[in-house]
Interface confidence: medium
């Protein structure tokens, strides 16, 4: 069961998973100037059996300037909806994740991948929060969030983490300081974690031959 919502936003904090539950999807996103190849995959899917889990499919990006004439498989549209994003932090190999049954490790990077990874989480997924550089963590409880199913609806538990503006960085176990500085961010996006939520659509019936798709992005 996919989690309906994004993990909670904590001011001056970002989250990541130490491992990904089977059923998790990772969109094949490409950096600016590149797009997915048609013969490639829409997403990677964490699949497996009781003894081993791995990512099904590989992501491939090609230059937007290069026409791709392969016509057999799914095209790879830019996906900015129903998505959970975590900043790519260089390099991320969470601790002990391979030993977790029913979970996949962080997928290796692919050529020309986007600066943010877009995951579709499933029920039972746990994500861990850390304060961004320049902020210190005041722990008042667990700094993690779990996607739970309650009364037929999914929800994320609220992490008890406050990040204060002191020049000190809280980090994940065994990790170096994050160095990511995602490129191409719209200026309006000021937090270090961008979770793109839903779009609103406004359609107007028009007595002309023109059909319009109007969307408004909001955070």
């Amino acid at each position: 069961e996919l989690c309906d919502d994004d993990p909670p936003e904590i001011p001056h904090a970002t989250f990541k998973a130490m491992a990904y539950k089977e059923g998790t999807m990772l969109n094949c996103e490409c950096k600016r100037g590149f797009r997915r190849i048609k013969s490639g995959s829409l997403y990677m899917l964490c699949t497996g059996n009781s003894s081993h889990s791995s990512w099904d499919n590989q992501c491939q990006c090609t230059s937007s300037a290069t026409r791709n004439t392969t016509k057999q498989v799914t095209p790879q549209p830019e996906e900015q909806k129903e998505r959970k994003t975590t900043e790519m932090q260089s390099p991320m190999q969470p601790v002990d994740q391979a030993s977790l049954p029913g979970h996949c490790r962080e997928p290796p990077p692919w050529e020309n991948e986007a600066t943010e990874r877009i995951y579709h989480f499933v029920v039972g997924q746990m994500v861990y929060y850390q304060c961004v550089q320049g902020y210190r963590a005041l722990h008042r409880g667990p700094a993690e969030s779990v996607c739970k199913m309650t009364h037929g609806k999914t929800r994320w538990t609220q992490p008890q983490l406050i990040c204060t503006g002191e020049m000190e960085t809280s980090q994940f176990p065994g990790e170096e300081k994050p160095q990511a500085s995602p490129e191409g961010r719209p200026e309006s996006e000021t937090s270090c974690l961008v979770t793109t939520t839903d779009f609103q659509i406004q359609t107007e019936m028009a007595a002309t031959m023109e059909t319009s798709i109007f969307t408004t992005e909001y955070q």
Partner: antibody, heavy 104, light 107 residues
Framework: PGESLKISCKGS????????IAWVRQMPGKGLEWMGI????????TYSPSFQGQVTISADKSITTTYLQWSSLKASDTAMYYC??????????WGQGTLVTVSS | DIVLTQSPSSLSASVGDRVTITCRAS??????LSWYQQKPGKAPERLIF???GLQRGVPSRFSGSGSGTEFTLTISSLQPEDFATYYC?????????FGQGTKLEIK
Amino acid sequence: PGESLKISCKGSGYSFTTYWIAWVRQMPGKGLEWMGIIYPGDSDTTYSPSFQGQVTISADKSITTTYLQWSSLKASDTAMYYCARQVAGGLDYWGQGTLVTVSS
Amino acid sequence: DIVLTQSPSSLSASVGDRVTITCRASQAVRIDLSWYQQKPGKAPERLIFGASGLQRGVPSRFSGSGSGTEFTLTISSLQPEDFATYYCLQHNTFPYTFGQGTKLEIK
């Protein structure tokens, strides 16, 4: 019948060149039919075999508009035509549709 | 082409009923299937993506399940505004294809 026609679909409020746009036909009283798709960034197109050679899908990214065009209309082209934004999870946003009526 | 077969083609139900619509694919489409609701004179609207993901803003009485070749859309407790036509769409393999639709009518 026999006339040419070009209908348009304008996208706004998102990065037009980085999303695929699909065209969908709905004949009177019938279901939805996926016609084809275009990537406005480079005008790469793919058609359903049922529509290949019958219509042309194009785009003008400078005005964030995609087009569906017929060179010679037939009575059987009478239908509602929708454009929709194609994302990994299907068709997330749809235009309100353009009704094309072909009569002699 | 992948053929999607919806069943039933039409269905009469009452407000409060639990309704299930099935979509079968002629070959496996993994979870690349979405569900749409269309009301007369209106454009379709997406309800479910990725076979089971609920579109934001869609009431939680709608749910989707399945993978591979068999998928279901369930409405747990029908409301008056739910009477419409429902379509499934596979977006796994070109050409993408819709099911023929299921018309849900008030009993």
